[in-house]
Amino acid sequence: SAGAGSHCQKTSLRVNFEDIGWDSWIIAPKEYEAYECKGGCFFPLADDVTPTKHAIVQTLVHLKFPTKVGKACCVPTKLSPISVLYKDDMGVPTLKYHYEGMSVAECGCR
Amino acid sequence: SAGAGSHCQKTSLRVNFEDIGWDSWIIAPKEYEAYECKGGCFFPLADDVTPTKHAIVQTLVHLKFPTKVGKACCVPTKLSPISVLYKDDMGVPTLKYHYEGMSVAECGCR
């Protein structure tokens, strides 16, 4: 598992819609793989975390002034859709094939 | 200033190119305003932090399982270019008007 000491990476995060109160409108699935971006953005930032120039700059400044400036943060840089069955305004079960931005496709340092 | 207890926002970060070792190729400016994204992504996520659906989901899961899942992170969501004077391969001082991704334009929760 990706702890604070490990490098920024995508890890599993199973989300149950009941846990977050979304089961009132999402019929199915009951849960899905959301993934989570975990780990640190350590110097030097590797290519696989696709750092922006700003993230590289912030990492270098953090290296010199660690108490003044934070490290870059490991976050989703690309998201994927999931398909959900939900109830519309009339209560009709409706399938949304692409419910965008629900699952992490890629993580990076920003 | 935006501390850990404050909400995600853009704060000043003056970067001196000498401090990060980039003065060897960037002639001018000597320093620039990079900005930094600081502060927490607390529930409920406000519109001004332009949360993705995944960030909203992760925030809700963190609310229920705070030790298992982290909060969303306050990061640059839009970057701006700066202009820099650098030396080309022949040592000719050259102006790059748009050196992309160097300064934070907007912060958000991701």
Partner: antibody
């Protein structure tokens, strides 16, 4: 070694025409803005014209004093710069320098060529 | 157009002494935190040579005795210890706006 060599200038009558050329070597000609700068006898330096890169669609700019009379052009395949001067006036007399550089500075200079406009 | 005005027009300095040439622009030549100001040296019968760029950076092969300073509209070229080979005309030049313009020149001689 960077070299810019201007063609021989000469004497031309007022109202006449002359074409200057400049042969470049020692650097990647197509990567640099090219300019003509002139210097009247015993006087200061005056930027005349520049031509930018292919990526800028070879955009040109001229000093007000020569606009409509002078035309700057380049041939990247020959590493050559040109200045076509028409409707010449006595005040166009001077040493014409071919210069290369960036969007920031005149970095490379030729030795210059003397153009004399006189009747 | 941005007008560049140098002072003095001519200057006589003893060998080993400091020489200072000033240049004033009719408007600021700074932008993006960068000074669009260069200095050239022209010796008799030769083309100009880049001495200082971006107000304070030495050109390639330029001796350390040459330095530049200033920002905005006021700039200075300093020769810390004048040598015989420094006899020349010095020009300031701005590249912030087309047309790129030069100062009228300052003639430096040995006293």
């Amino acid at each position: 070694e960077v070299q810019l060599v201007e063609s021989r200038g000469g004497l031309v009558q007022p109202g006449g025409s002359m074409r200057l050329s400049c042969a470049a070597s020692g650097f990647t000609f197509s990567n640099y803005w090219m300019n003509w700068v002139r210097q009247a006898p015993g006087k200061g330096l005056e930027w005349v014209a520049h031509i930018r890169l292919k990526s800028d669609n070879y955009a040109t700019h001229y000093a007000e004093s020569v606009r409509g009379r002078f035309t700057i052009s380049r041939d990247d395949s020959k590493s050559s710069l040109y200045l076509q001067m028409n409707s010449l006036k006595t005040e166009d007399t001077g040493v014409y320098y071919c210069t290369g550089g960036s969007n920031y500075v005149f970095a490379f200079w030729g030795q210059g060529t003397l153009v004399t406009v006189s009747s | 157009d941005i007008v560049m005005t140098q002072s003095p027009d001519s200057l006589a300095v003893s060998l080993g002494e400091r020489a200072t040439i000033n240049c004033r622009a009719s408007e600021s030549v700074d932008n993006y935190g960068i000074s669009f100001m260069n200095w050239f040296q022209q010796k008799p019968g030769q083309p100009p040579k880049l001495l200082i760029y971006a107000a304070s950076n030495q050109g390639s092969g330029v001796p350390d005795r040459f330095s530049g300073s200033g920002s905005g509209t006021d700039f200075t070229l300093t020769i810390s210890s004048l040598q015989a080979e420094d006899v020349a005309v010095y020009f300031c030049q701005q590249s912030k706006e087309v047309p790129w313009t030069f100062g009228q020149g300052t003639k430096l001689e040995i006293k």
